[in-house]
Interface confidence: low
């Protein structure tokens, strides 16, 4: 494997062995630079299995509002504008990070936490068990 | 709002404006205690708007493995089991938090970034564009 | 997929001494640390040995320092820990564990290997 060398314009960390405590900067690089800003504004209508956003919000976590998706049907809307039961709306989940103030109400000190947000929904073909 | 006093237990940090840079433990705390963990694993397959997942590695991003979402069709599956042009496949896309080592290869040094990420796909009616 | 495959473990008197295994697949062994973390019986996880990328810089927990090594051959995927002077306070189960970027959050690991030292 190629050799990285720990670069010396590290910080100090009081332990080397294995830190637990990290410093991050908390000016966000924004890797998007050339997305349009409403790419799926407007799917959540759109799509067969829609959704409704809704707002979680807390003053403790970064970032501290988050949009939950919550399908608006069991099933799927068909070519005719009918919810059709064949079908089932699923919500889409992706695991995230986020800070968390910890102790609480401090200004500088987070801790990392992973948490499972429901992104939009999607429209699937329904697993049938069937009873011998 | 509510009016929440600074805990006097808090780390001491140089600037109380607003800090750039804090204190972060690593001990993450994962609140997705309950979930199944192939919670969404065959939606990719079973949806109408079906999607291959890409493997995005990079060692000095945490997480440093995100499964990136690739909608197989610009049309979606219909009854048949056909693709249907009248319907659109679309990345459902949400904007991440991840770490990345600043400056590079340090162990306890991070700047939080955000990429946009395409989580799965979803079936949504097209734009119809009518020209006068 | 990511594997870990732990061997090695056994029984063994104080004194004693073992050589762990760890045979990774499923993703770019050498551009990941690498970790040998450790349960006792009715204990929390442990870290115990971290190694870096290309084997150059190994750090250790303090109670294992000098008696354990860890090592890893790239070419084989391959992690190891070389324990020495083994006490009855190492009796565990232990895990190979792949690093992230963040030292404390493994992401994946093996199935375990128990040692037990024990006259």
């Known amino acids: 494997g190629i050799t990285i060398p720990r670069n010396p314009g590290c910080p100090n960390s009081e332990d080397k062995n294995f830190p637990r405590t990290v410093m991050v900067n908390l000016n966000i690089h924004n890797r998007n630079t050339n997305t349009n800003p409403k790419r799926s504004s407007d799917y959540y209508n759109r799509s067969t299995s829609p959704w409704n956003l809704h707002r979680n919000e807390d003053p403790e976590r970064y970032p501290s509002v988050i949009w939950e998706a919550k399908c608006r049907h069991l099933g799927c809307i068909n070519a005719d504008g009918n919810v059709d039961y064949h079908m089932n709306s699923v919500p889409i989940q992706q695991e995230i990070l986020v800070l968390r103030r910890e102790p609480p109400h401090c200004p500088n000190s987070f801790r990392l936490e992973k948490i499972l947000v429901s992104v939009g929904c999607t429209c699937v073909t329904p697993i049938v068990h069937h009873v011998a | 709002g509510i009016t929440i006093p600074r805990n006097p237990g808090c780390p001491n940090s140089e600037d109380k404006n607003f800090p750039r840079t804090v204190m972060v433990n690593l001990n993450i705390h994962n609140r997705n205690t309950n979930t199944n963990p192939k919670r969404s694993s065959d939606y990719y397959n079973r949806s109408t708007s079906p999607w291959n997942l890409h493997r995005n590695e990079d060692p000095e991003r945490y997480p440093s493995v995100i499964w990136e979402a690739k909608c197989r069709h610009l049309g979606c599956i219909n009854a048949d089991g056909n693709v249907d042009y009248h319907m659109n496949s679309v990345p459902i896309q949400q904007e991440i938090l991840v770490l990345r080592r600043e400056p590079p290869h340090c162990p306890n040094s991070f700047r939080l970034e955000k990429i946009l990420v395409s989580v799965g796909c979803t079936c949504v009616t097209p734009i119809v564009h009518h020209v006068a | 997929e990511v594997q870990l495959v732990e061997s090695g473990g056994g029984l063994v008197q104080p004194g004693g001494s073992l050589r762990l295994s760890c045979a990774a697949s499923g993703f770019t062994f050498s551009s990941y640390s690498m970790y040998w973390v450790r349960q006792a019986p009715g204990k929390g996880l442990e870290w115990v040995a971290e190694i870096k990328q290309d084997g150059s810089v190994q750090y250790y927990v303090s109670d294992v320092k000098g008696r354990f090594t860890i090592s890893r051959d790239n070419a084989k995927n391959s992690l190891y820990l070389q324990m020495n002077s083994l006490r009855a306070e190492d009796t565990a189960v232990y895990y190979c564990?792949?690093?992230?970027?963040?030292?404390?959050?493994?992401?994946?690991w093996g199935q375990g290997t128990l040692v037990t030292v024990s006259s």
């Open positions: 564990a792949k690093g992230e970027i963040l030292p404390l959050y493994f992401d994946y």
